[in-house]
């Protein structure tokens, strides 16, 4: 377990947050488009 704790780094956390934000924006956009098309 030499590097066990260091996998939970702030830089990794920031990347995860950026991905989540991007996915939320894309999915939100698709949902709006679907509602609009109805």
């Amino acid at each position: 377990h030499s590097d066990g704790i260091f996998t939970d780094s702030y830089s990794r956390y920031r990347k995860q947050m950026a991905v989540k934000k991007y996915l939320a924006a894309v999915l939100g956009k698709r949902y709006k488009q679907r509602v609009k098309n109805k």
Epitope: S2, I5, F6, T7, D8, S9, Y10, S11, Y13
Partner: antibody, heavy 113, light 110 residues
């Protein structure tokens, strides 16, 4: 994403006490959580950490006095085995492996007879 | 256990001025850069400022600057504002999965 500590209270010396850290917005399966304490008017003191796999590591002074355990996917406990008056402090839970980027507000433990 | 020594323990400077805080570690931090800085005001939990020696956390003004590597690190706060008055701590992560905090530096803004 946030963390919150609970369980702090007034205890007499030698009475075991368990503090709980509850996380929200993320899972402990991908996080390392530390316990840090701060005696009144003093600096921050690292107690120990539990990694995403449940492995625990402690400051050498804390090894025999504290036990950290994961009790669910959202809770981590800190057990004070036999508190002394020297353990009077605010106890913080913080996320991150050696860099502590999400902190709770802390819970106050007072050890007094 | 590793020991982190912060100097000075207290520093005073005028609004608009600059303060420098040093943090020396008794052993090299993980990857030579696993050193972070925190700001704490009375009655509050610490606020994460800088990670991996020199990177600013989200929302932290660029007036805060971290530098250093291995065992010697520095936090510089320029263009001081009244709100910067606080106690600052360094923290290190080390091989063997242990961590530690410096003793803290009180910054007084005049």
């Amino acid at each position: 994403q946030s963390v919150e500590e609970s369980g702090g209270r007034l205890v007499t010396p030698g009475t075991p006490l368990t503090l709980t850290c509850t996380v929200s917005g993320f899972s402990l399966s991908s996080a390392a959580m530390s316990w840090v304490r701060q005696a009144p008017g003093k600096g921050l003191e690292w107690i120990g950490i539990i990694d995403d796999s449940g492995n625990t590591y402690y400051a050498s002074w804390a090894k025999a006095r504290f036990t950290i355990s994961k009790t669910s996917s959202t809770t981590v406990d800190l057990k004070m085995t036999s508190p002394t008056t020297e353990d009077t402090a605010t106890y913080f839970c913080a996320r991150g492996g050696g860099e502590f980027f999400i902190w709770g507000p802390g819970t106050l433990v007072t050890v007094s007879s | 256990d590793p020991v982190l020594t912060q100097t000075p323990s207290s520093v005073s400077a005028a609004v608009g001025g600059t303060v420098t805080i040093n943090c020396q570690s008794s052993q090299s931090v993980y990857n030579n850069k696993w050193l972070s800085w925190y700001q704490q005001k009375p009655g509050q939990s610490p606020k994460f400022l800088i990670y991996q020696a020199s990177n600013l956390a989200s929302g932290v003004p660029s007036r805060f600057k971290g530098s250093g590597s291995g065992t010697q690190f520095t936090l510089t706060i320029s263009d001081l504002e009244c709100d910067d008055g606080a106690t600052y701590y360094c923290a290190g992560g080390y091989r063997g999965n242990v961590c530690g905090f410096g003793g803290g530096t009180e910054v007084v803004v005049k």
